[in-house]
Interface confidence: medium
C-alpha cells in the first residue's frame, strides 16, 4: 500500500513538473531593458531580408510590448521556417514509380514559441547520379 | 517621390483630443511601418511608437500608452496619431516617418505638425 | 530603455574644420545606429544608417564608425550649409532612443 502511495506522489510530481515545463516553452523570461516586467512572451524572429539574417522579434508582456533584434542562422532549414530545426534520416530508396525518394525529418529544436510541426516528410528527385550513389553508399549515413 | 505629408499647427485646450494625419505617396504605403516622433520646444526626439499598415499591429514607447493611439486607413494611405487628455507637456512639433524590416531607419519624415495646447 | 549619450551638446566651428561627434549606448546596440540632420524649421534628415552606411545622395564627407557602445559621427571638411542639429539613435531595441542632439554653428 506504501508503495503504491509513493508512485502516486511521484507521477503527480512528474505531472506537475511537465505542466511547467510546458507552460515555460510559451513564454521566455527576459525583463526588456529598463522592464519591470518578468514573464515576457516573444513571437518568432522576423528577418529583414526574406529568410534568415538580422531581424526583429516582437515580444509581449501584459499590455507591454517590445522589439529587438534577433538573428536567424542562414543555414536552417528555410523551407520550414526559420524557426524550426529538424534531424532527418537518411534518405529512402528511390521510388520507380514516382521517379522520388524522402526522407522524414523529426522536430530537433524550436526557437522560443515557433509554430512547427513535430515531424516533417521531405521528397526530391532522384537522377541517375544520385541513383548509382544510393546503391553505392547503402547503409552509410547522411546524403 | 517619396512623400509624407502633415497637417497644419493645432492649437487646443487642456484636457481635449487631437488626430493628427500623416498621408503617405510615392511609395506602397503597406511596405512600411509607420513610426511618431515627438520633438519638445528646443529638445531632443522621442519615438512615440510606430504601427504596421498591413495588420495594424501597434508597437508603442511605454512612456506614451495611454496618450498616443496610432491607426491607419489603407483605402487613403493615411497614417493617423490621436494624442487625448492634453496637458502644456504635450506641446510640440509631432512628426512621422517611415521604416521597414528591411531598412530599420527613418529613412522619411513628414514636415512635422506643431500642437499647442494652452487655455 | 537604451539610453544614448551624446557629445558634445554645441560645436562651433570654422567652415573647412573637421568635426566629431561621440555617441555612447547604455549597452550593447551591435552596429544598429543611425545619424540625422536637422536643420533649423525643418523635419530631421537621414544621412548614417547601420552606424557606417552612407544614405543615398548624402555627400561623402559625412562618416560614421563604431561598433557595440561607442560611436562617432564625422565631418571631414564643414562647410556653412552644414549648420544644423545632429542626433544618434539606436534600432536595436524597443523604444528606439536618441542622443540628447548636437547643434553646430559655424563662424
Known amino acids: 500500500m506504501q508503495h503504491r502511495g509513493f508512485l502516486l506522489l511521484t507521477l503527480l510530481a512528474l505531472l506537475a513538473l511537465t505542466s511547467a515545463v510546458a507552460k515555460k516553452k510559451d513564454k521566455v523570461k527576459k525583463g526588456g531593458p529598463g522592464s519591470e516586467c518578468a514573464e515576457w512572451a516573444w513571437g518568432p524572429c522576423t528577418p529583414s531580408s526574406k529568410d534568415c539574417g538580422v531581424g526583429f522579434r516582437e515580444g509581449t508582456c501584459g499590455a507591454q510590448t517590445q522589439r529587438i533584434r534577433c538573428r536567424v542562422p542562414c543555414n536552417w532549414k528555410k523551407e520550414f521556417g526559420a524557426d524550426c530545426k529538424y534531424k532527418f534520416e537518411n534518405w529512402g530508396a528511390c521510388d520507380g514509380g514516382t521517379g522520388t525518394k524522402v526522407r522524414q525529418g523529426t522536430l530537433k529544436k524550436a526557437r522560443y514559441n515557433a509554430q512547427c510541426q513535430e515531424t516533417i516528410r521531405v521528397t526530391k528527385p532522384c537522377t541517375p547520379k544520385t541513383k548509382a550513389k544510393a546503391k553505392a553508399k547503402k547503409g552509410k549515413g547522411k546524403d | 517621390e517619396v512623400q509624407l505629408q502633415q497637417s497644419g499647427p493645432e492649437l487646443v485646450k487642456p484636457g481635449a483630443s487631437v488626430k493628427i494625419p500623416c498621408k503617405a505617396s510615392?511609395?506602397?504605403?503597406?511596405?512600411?511601418?509607420m513610426g511618431w516622433v515627438k520633438q519638445s520646444h528646443g529638445k531632443s526626439l522621442e519615438w512615440i511608437g510606430d504601427?504596421?499598415?498591413?495588420?495594424?499591429?501597434?508597437i508603442y514607447n511605454q512612456k506614451f500608452k495611454g496618450k498616443a493611439t496610432l491607426t491607419v486607413d489603407k483605402s487613403s494611405s493615411t497614417a493617423y496619431m490621436e494624442l487625448r487628455s492634453l496637458t502644456s507637456e504635450d506641446t510640440a512639433v509631432y512628426y512621422c516617418?517611415?521604416?521597414?524590416?528591411?531598412?530599420?531607419?527613418?529613412?522619411?519624415w513628414g514636415q512635422g505638425t506643431t500642437l499647442t495646447v494652452s487655455s | 530603455s537604451i539610453v544614448m549619450t551624446q557629445t558634445p551638446n554645441f560645436l562651433l566651428v570654422s567652415a573647412g574644420d573637421r568635426v566629431t561627434i561621440t555617441c555612447k549606448a547604455s549597452?550593447?546596440?551591435?552596429?544598429?545606429v543611425s545619424w540625422y540632420q536637422q536643420k533649423p524649421g525643418q523635419s530631421p534628415k537621414l544621412l548614417i544608417y547601420y552606424a557606417s552606411n552612407l544614405y543615398t545622395g548624402v555627400p561623402d564627407r559625412f562618416t560614421g564608425s563604431g561598433y557595440g557602445t561607442d560611436f562617432t559621427f564625422t565631418i571631414s571638411t564643414v562647410q556653412a550649409e552644414d549648420l544644423a542639429v545632429y542626433f544618434c539613435q539606436q534600432d536595436y531595441s524597443s523604444p528606439w532612443t536618441f542622443g540628447g542632439g548636437t547643434k553646430l554653428e559655424i563662424k
Open positions: 510615392g511609395y506602397t504605403f503597406t511596405d512600411y511601418n
Open positions: 549597452q550593447s546596440v551591435s552596429n544598429d
Open positions: 504601427i504596421n499598415p498591413n495588420n495594424g499591429g501597434t
Open positions: 516617418a517611415r521604416w521597414s524590416y528591411s531598412n530599420p531607419y527613418f529613412d522619411y
